[in-house]
């Protein structure tokens, strides 16, 4: 039905093409493994069209199946560093509402300094996605090395 | 508005679904770190629907947000080779027009022989994407190991 | 033309937005390198909207260009394990019909325990995709570590 309305020239938002690409703002305080994200036209090539940021975490505004993708690069890192400080792990999941909490995507760095992956997953309005980086190494904030995004694919 | 015209049965191109998937043609001459790509029906499973190739580099024909993805595998490579020849780095960026030059995506191989990633980024008509591979190792030209593509996602 | 029909309020399936995200069910018997997948609402966050499973392999129902993505994580794995058991390789390809058999995507684990990649590729109705994992290490069945999916992008 959403697509049936195309003839009425409704704005793209009504077509359901929510999309966001975020850059790293900062890491969390003590005992908080979350990465905090930022996005918007004043911040280079990051943007939010539909989803919103809630205290640095991405909140979904439209039900549907989404492509979620992420790349995280560790700063001042070599394969020796990465293996010496193993395990360093990144997990992307729904962290709220608590009733829907689940890990969607998980990767370890092993002897590498970058992880990158993507997956399709159903998300609902109000779902907040968190990206947890556990370990002793800090991520790069360079916008071409660390980024996180979602793309609405279909209802 | 583009979608509002769907009822007029315009060709898909007018809907803005530009997409391309390229295979490696060759590497650049001395001092040129760029990879040169090729695509088209005569070349197996690569294709260009909208974007064009300009001297082996991908040129965008439609403004919008794109999903850019790449995989590069180093030829005759083992983890020992990769670490011995470290750093080998791949960067994808807008290389022209010069005023819009920026790195979009960067990865190092460390002890691995393949990198793969993807990201959402705004691109404008006329933007040319370059993929720079720096280091002493050469990429595989196997079409299932090394490829580069873009997909228009929304205006 | 498919999009021109939007005004008739046809179901999404007629718009061609076929999509699937699968989780690992089991590995094949001796001499069968294939991974066997499962998906559906009863299985957490996996789903099939359009494509079907045929004995654990993904069969395409609609011609078009697809984004194919995969992540496979090896179970009980460290970088030492991965390098000691090298080569462990994952290949995604069309395995039937035999006349269209081709490898689409190939990655080796080297010193890592996870591979993840994605690519655009034309697929035709009836194409069956197989994911072959060769080597002595077994994949994790955790749904956030090993998954495989496709998304219809355009005709």
């Amino acid at each position: 039905q959403r697509f049936a309305q195309a003839q009425q020239q409704l704005p793209l938002e009504s077509l359901g093409w929510d999309v966001a690409e975020l850059q790293l703002n900062h890491t969390g305080p003590q005992q908080d493994p979350r990465l905090y994200w930022q996005g918007g036209p004043a911040l280079g090539r990051s943007f939010l069209h539909g989803p919103e940021l809630d205290k640095g975490q991405l909140r979904i505004h439209r039900d549907g199946i989404y492509m979620v993708h992420i790349q995280v690069t560790l700063a001042i890192c070599s394969s020796t560093t990465a293996s010496r400080h193993h395990p360093t792990t990144l997990a992307v999941g729904i962290c709220s509402p608590a009733s829907r909490s689940i890990s969607l995507l998980r990767l370890s760095f092993h002897q590498g300094c970058t992880i990158a992956s993507q997956r399709l997953t159903p998300l609902a309005r109000g779902d907040t996605l968190c990206t947890n980086l556990t370990g002793t190494l800090l991520p790069s904030r360079n916008t071409d090395e660390t980024f996180f995004g979602v793309q609405w694919v279909r209802p | 508005q583009r979608f509002a015209q769907a009822q007029q049965q315009l060709p898909l191109e007018s809907l803005g679904w530009d997409v391309a998937e390229l295979q490696l043609n060759h590497t650049g001459p001395q001092q040129d770190p760029r990879l040169y790509w090729q695509g088209g029906p005569a070349l197996g499973r690569s294709f260009l629907h909208g974007p064009e190739l300009d001297k082996g580099q991908l040129r965008i024909h439609r403004d919008g947000i794109y999903m850019v993805h790449i995989q590069v595998t180093l030829a005759i490579c083992s983890s020992t080779t990769a670490s011995r020849h470290h750093p080998t780095t791949l960067a994808v960026g807008i290389c022209s027009p010069a005023s819009r030059s920026i790195s979009l995506l960067r990865l190092s191989f460390h002890q691995g022989c393949t990198i793969a990633s993807q990201r959402l980024t705004p691109l404008a008509r006329g933007d040319t994407l370059c993929t720079n591979l720096t280091g002493t190792l050469l990429p595989s030209r196997n079409t299932d190991e090394t490829f580069f593509g873009v997909q228009w996602v929304r205006p | 033309q498919r999009f021109a029909q939007a005004q008739q309020q046809l179901p999404l399936e007629s718009l061609g937005w076929d999509v699937a995200e699968l989780q690992l069910n089991h590995t094949g018997p001796q001499q069968d390198p294939r991974l066997y997948w499962q998906g559906g609402p009863a299985l957490g966050r996996s789903f099939l909207h359009g494509p079907e499973l045929d004995k654990g392999q993904l069969r395409i129902h609609r011609d078009g260009i697809y984004m194919v993505h995969i992540q496979v994580t090896l179970a009980i794995c460290s970088s030492t394990t991965a390098s000691r058991h090298h080569p462990t390789t994952l290949a995604v390809g069309i395995c039937s019909p035999a006349s269209r058999s081709i490898s689409l995507l190939r990655l080796s684990f080297h010193q890592g325990c996870t591979i993840a990649s994605q690519r655009l590729t034309p697929l035709a109705r009836g194409d069956t995709l197989c994911t072959n994992l060769t080597g002595t290490l077994l994949p994790s069945r955790n749904t956030d570590e090993t998954f495989f999916g496709v998304q219809w992008v355009r005709p």
């Epitope: 690069t73 002793t136 800090l138 790069s140 916008t143 | - | -």
Partner: antibody, heavy 119, light 107 residues
Framework: QVQLVQSGAEVKKPGASVKVSCKAS????????MHWVRQAPGQGLEWMGW????????SYAQQFQGRVTMTRDTSMSTVYMELTRLRADDTAVYYC????????????WGQGTLVTVSS | DIQMTQSPSSLSASVGDRVTITCQAS??????LNWYQQKPGKVPNLLIY???NLETGVPSRFSGSGSGTDFTFTISSLQPEDIATYYC?????????FGQGTRLEIK
């Protein structure tokens, strides 16, 4: 504003140990690596290692491995660098520094602590 | 470890001169290179980060360029207050390493 305040100068005998402190203020202490860099009299800069104040994890330069220990007290927003088995060529000014790297903007240094090793 | 070789180790120039210092890395370090100024008895001060970006508050007569293994630091018009030692520093790979320094004095 960001400030890194180090402990005062020390005079030590060869074979002894020294522990230098660095108190941080004006920023999120656990959000950045704290580095230690030393400079011998009339010489260049030499990186010793970093500590992640959030996790306590460390990375040391090879030449200091086994002799240096970096620790932190998050309640005091303070990091410590202890160097053992001191030699005459360890005589240097020791700096704690929140160095710029990989988009983590702001480059701040403590005032330096002169450690003199002499018999 | 990555060796950073600076040249020259010292140089003398006149006020208003264009001054160039080079830094060569023993292996490719992308653009992960910073330039510091250290005046006698003072702490180092970051001038240029990531090879070519001017740190906030630093005069525009300072600039940097290069990528990979070869980098250049330039003062377009030398001022008396620029008398200092200049260091390049890489952070691509641990350990972080500094060049040996270039001592700059006025003729």
């Amino acid at each position: 504003q960001v400030q890194l305040v180090q402990s005062g100068a020390e005079v030590k005998k060869p074979g002894a140990s020294v522990k230098v402190s660095c108190k941080a203020s004006g920023y999120s202490f656990t959000g950045y690596y704290m580095h230690w860099v030393r400079q011998a009299p009339g010489q260049g800069l030499e990186w010793m290692g970093w500590i992640n104040p959030k996790s306590g994890g460390t990375s040391y330069a090879q030449q200091f491995q086994g002799r240096v220990t970096m620790t932190r007290d998050t309640s005091m927003s303070t990091v410590y660098m202890e160097l053992t088995r001191l030699r005459a060529d360890d005589t240097a000014v020791y700096y704690c520094a929140r160095l710029y790297y990989s988009g983590w903007y702001g480059d701040y240094w403590g005032q330096g602590t002169l450690v003199t090793v002499s018999s | 470890d990555i060796q950073m070789t600076q040249s020259p180790s010292s140089l003398s120039a006149s006020v208003g001169d264009r001054v160039t210092i080079t830094c060569q890395a023993s292996q490719d370090i992308n653009n992960y290179l910073n330039w510091y100024q250290q005046k006698p008895g003072k702490v180092p001060n970051l001038l240029i980060y990531d090879a070519s970006n001017l740190e906030t508050g630093v005069p525009s007569r300072f600039s940097g360029s290069g990528s990979g293994t070869d980098f250049t630091f330039t003062i377009s018009s030398l001022q008396p207050e620029d008398i200092a030692t200049y260091y390049c520093q890489q952070y691509n790979n641990p350990p972080i390493t500094f060049g040996q320094g270039t001592r700059l004095e006025i003729k």
